[in-house]
């Protein structure tokens, strides 16, 4: 690489192709998979990131739900349809014409149907609960130090406004991070909690999306915080619509 090419990269998304051919030689970056232009001064939307990652191996999980309306991402990876702003389209379909409705973080919130399935609006995920279990340490972390470090992480690394980190709970070895962001609270330019949670999830798995930055090195008062499992629960502004068959399964 030359100096120019090294400068023309996307610090917030390594799954991009960049070239300095924008107006006045501006560096312009496009997301792999979709070819959509991305704003490299902030996080890329989860929809565009999933689209770029569509060839990655399937990563299915079965999670315990914290409440009857909480959703988990059991379906793993899929190649999503994104709107011109990079958000998930409310209705997603696969190549065999099986369709379903998703929320703003791309998680299925209805039973699967056919092409006649209607998804009237993209329902916002306004509450995300990130449930972590850390590896054994000599002693428990100090709660207020842990709280401060995680808030700093979301503010500095993911550029999420501190008001959207609602709480950090800790009962060794379980850490819970609550992110809350209603439609009315999210101003133009604010990072979406869904995008921040996705970047965090990928960081925790050692699959950082940031360009050229080292992986996530979480430390609380110098003590490494090593996560051994992550569960993420999503709560929507409107409860999901699943058949009774699924709910009793």
């Amino acid at each position: 690489h030359t100096a120019a090419q090294d400068n023309c990269t996307c610090p917030t998304n390594k799954m991009t192709v960049c070239s300095p051919d924008g107006p006045g030689g501006r560096c312009q970056c496009r997301a792999l998979g979709s070819g959509m232009a991305v704003d490299c001064s902030t996080l890329t939307s989860k929809c565009l990131l999933l689209k770029a990652r569509m060839s990655a191996p399937k990563n299915a999980r079965t999670l315990v739900r914290p409440s009857e309306h909480a959703l988990v991402d059991n379906d793993g990876l899929y190649d999503p349809d994104c709107d011109p702003e990079g958000r998930f389209k409310a209705r997603q379909c696969n190549q065999t014409s099986v369709c379903w409705c998703v929320n703003s973080v791309g998680v299925r919130r209805t039973d699967k149907g056919d092409l006649s399935l209607r998804c009237d609006e993209l329902v916002r995920t306004h509450h995300i609960l990130i449930d972590l279990r850390h590896r054994p340490t000599a002693g428990a972390f100090n709660h207020s130090d842990l709280d401060a470090e995680l808030r700093r992480l979301f503010r500095e690394r993911y550029r999420l406004h501190p008001k959207f980190v609602a709480a950090v709970h800790y009962e060794q070895p379980t850490i819970q991070i609550e992110l809350r962001q209603n439609t009315s609270q999210k101003a133009a330019g604010d990072v979406d909690i869904g995008d921040a949670a996705y970047y965090f999830e990928r960081d925790i798995k050692g699959e950082s999306l940031f360009q050229g930055r080292g992986g996530l090195d979480l430390r609380v008062r110098g003590e490494p915080l090593q996560v051994e499992r992550t569960l993420i629960y999503y709560l929507d502004e409107i409860p999901p619509k699943f058949s009774m068959k699924r709910l009793t399964a």
């Epitope: 120019a4 400068n7 300095p20 051919d21 107006p23 006045g24 030689g25 501006r26």
Partner: antibody, heavy 116, light 107 residues
């Protein structure tokens, strides 16, 4: 250091064409865009267009579509601009400039005089 | 197209005086603005890019500021060699557009 050497002055007849050159040195030619700018005597600067030799992509000011054609020869690190169907309105100094993120290095300019 | 309105179109100033030239865009340009100096018979010289970043080798008496639609170039203490015509350029979107220029002369 970055240098852009433009071809010498041209005196051409109305209706004719002219092709001027901008030879780049001191950097990798395919890594930066070249822009072309027009300056008429006693008037301001006018952007003509931009070419990116790395992919041969270009953008034109709509006022110069059909008037200007931008090309780049990677083997000689040279950008070219051809002006067609010249009139007295095309008499001007034409600058080439290497741009990156709004920072420009300029050539010395090529004076074109259209005269019968 | 984005229209760049530059003012004043010409001005006279004393050596050592503080001089400010402004440029207003017809819409927000996200700080994608450059300033150039042009002298007769010479090629333009880049002074400022990205609204406030000083080009290497340009004297520190030059500074740029602004955001949104309104931007300015300031010369903190005018020097004899600063005489010339100054132009702003927006590169937020194609086509790139220049301001009309400001002719700076000695009083």
């Amino acid at each position: 250091q970055v240098q852009l050497q433009q071809s010498g002055p041209e005196v051409v007849k109305p209706g004719a064409s002219v092709k001027m050159s901008c030879k780049a040195s001191g950097y990798r030619f395919t890594d930066y865009v070249i822009n072309w700018v027009k300056q008429r005597t006693g008037q301001g600067l006018e952007w003509i267009g931009q070419i990116y030799p790395g992919s041969d992509s270009f953008h034109y000011n709509k006022n110069f579509k059909g008037k200007a054609t931008l090309t780049a020869d990677k083997s000689s690190n040279t950008a070219y601009m051809q002006l067609n169907s010249l009139t007295s309105e095309d008499s001007a100094v034409y600058f080439c400039a290497r741009f990156f993120e709004g920072l420009a290095y300029w050539g010395q300019g090529t004076l074109v005089t259209v005269s019968a | 197209d984005i229209k760049m309105t530059q003012s004043p179109s010409s001005m006279y100033a004393f050596l050592g005086e503080r001089v400010t030239i402004t440029c207003t865009a017809s819409q927000g340009i996200n700080n994608y603005l450059s300033w150039f100096q042009l002298k007769p018979g010479k090629s333009p010289k880049s002074l400022i890019y990205r609204a406030n970043r000083l080009v290497d080798g340009v004297p520190s008496r030059f500074s740029g500021s602004g955001s949104g639609q309104d931007y300015s170039l300031t010369i903190s203490s005018l020097d004899y060699e600063d005489m010339g015509i100054y132009y702003c350029l927006q590169y937020d979107e194609f086509p790139l557009t220049f301001g009309g220029g400001t002719k700076l002369e000695l009083k």
